[in-house]
C-alpha cells in the first residue's frame, strides 16, 4: 500500500513499501520477488505501439 501523502506512481511503476519509492515494473521480469511486483500485476504496463503488417 502506498504511503500516505505520496503522489501516485506513474504508469508502468508501482509503490515499494520496502524502498519507500515508486519502482519500475519492468524490473519484475528479472526479480519477481520484489514487494512492488504485486502492484505491477494489477496495473497495466506502460503503453507501447502495436506494429501492424
Amino acid at each position: 500500500e502506498q504511503a500516505p501523502g505520496t503522489a501516485p506512481c506513474s504508469r508502468g511503476s508501482s509503490w515499494s513499501a520496502d524502498l519507500d519509492k515508486c519502482m519500475d515494473c519492468a524490473s519484475c521480469r528479472a526479480r519477481p520477488h520484489s514487494d512492488f511486483c504485486q502492484g505491477c500485476a494489477a496495473a497495466p504496463p506502460a503503453p507501447f505501439r502495436l506494429l501492424w503488417p
Epitope: A3, A17, D18, L19, D20, A30, R31, H33, S34, D35
Partner: antibody
Amino acid sequence: EVQLLESGGGLVQPGGSLRLSCAASGFTFSPYPMIWVRQAPGKGLEWVSYISPSGGSTHYADSVKGRFTISRDNSKNTLYLQMNSLRAEDTAVYYCARGGDTYFDYFDYWGQGTLVTVSS
Amino acid sequence: DIQMTQSPSSLSASVGDRVTITCRASQSISGYLNWYQQKPGKAPKLLIYQASSLQSGVPSRFSGSGSGTDFTLTISSLQPEDFATYYCQQSYTSPFITFGQGTKVEIK
C-alpha cells in the same frame, strides 16, 4: 566520511533482553534502507533483519522472528535492534549495514560490530 | 530459501598468484550477486556488486563474473593485504538475503 557505530552489546543470560544501537554519521540517513547482520564466533555471516528508509516495512530471518524488533529514528540518525528471549545461539558479533542508494542490492558501509554473548 | 555455496572453503596462495573463488546459487539469481572481504576482527567490506561492478576505491586486481547460478571472484595478482575471508551474497530475493559460507585465503 560515512560511519556506522554499533553499541549496546554485552553479556546477557538466556531469556534476557538487549537493545543494540547503530549511530550513523557522514551521510543523510533517512533515504537508506538498513540491515542487521550477525556473525557467530568462527562462523559466517547471517542476515538478521531489514528496515525500509521510513521504518514502515520490516523483515526478519526465521531464526529471530517474533523475538527481535528492528526500528529506526531518522531524526536521531540511529538504527535499533531490540532483542528479547535471547538464546545461546544468538551469541555473535552484530553488524549494522547501509543498503545501496537505488535498491537494496548491496551493502556498501558496515559498522565495526558489537558483541552479544548469551550465557548463564 | 536460496542457498549459496562457495568453493573452496579455504585455499593457500602466494603473493602474486592469481586466485579464483567460486560461488554457486541453488537456483538462478540472474546477476544479483555481491562479494565482500572480511579481515579478522573487522567488518565486511564490499568489493563487487551486481556480479561484476567494482565498488569505488577497490583495487582493479579484483574482478567478478558470472550470471544465473555460477559466479567467480578473481584476484589477478594476490597482494599481502588480500589475505582474508571472502563471502558471496545473493540479493535476488532482497530484502531476504543470504551469504555463502566464506572462503579463507591464507598465505602459502
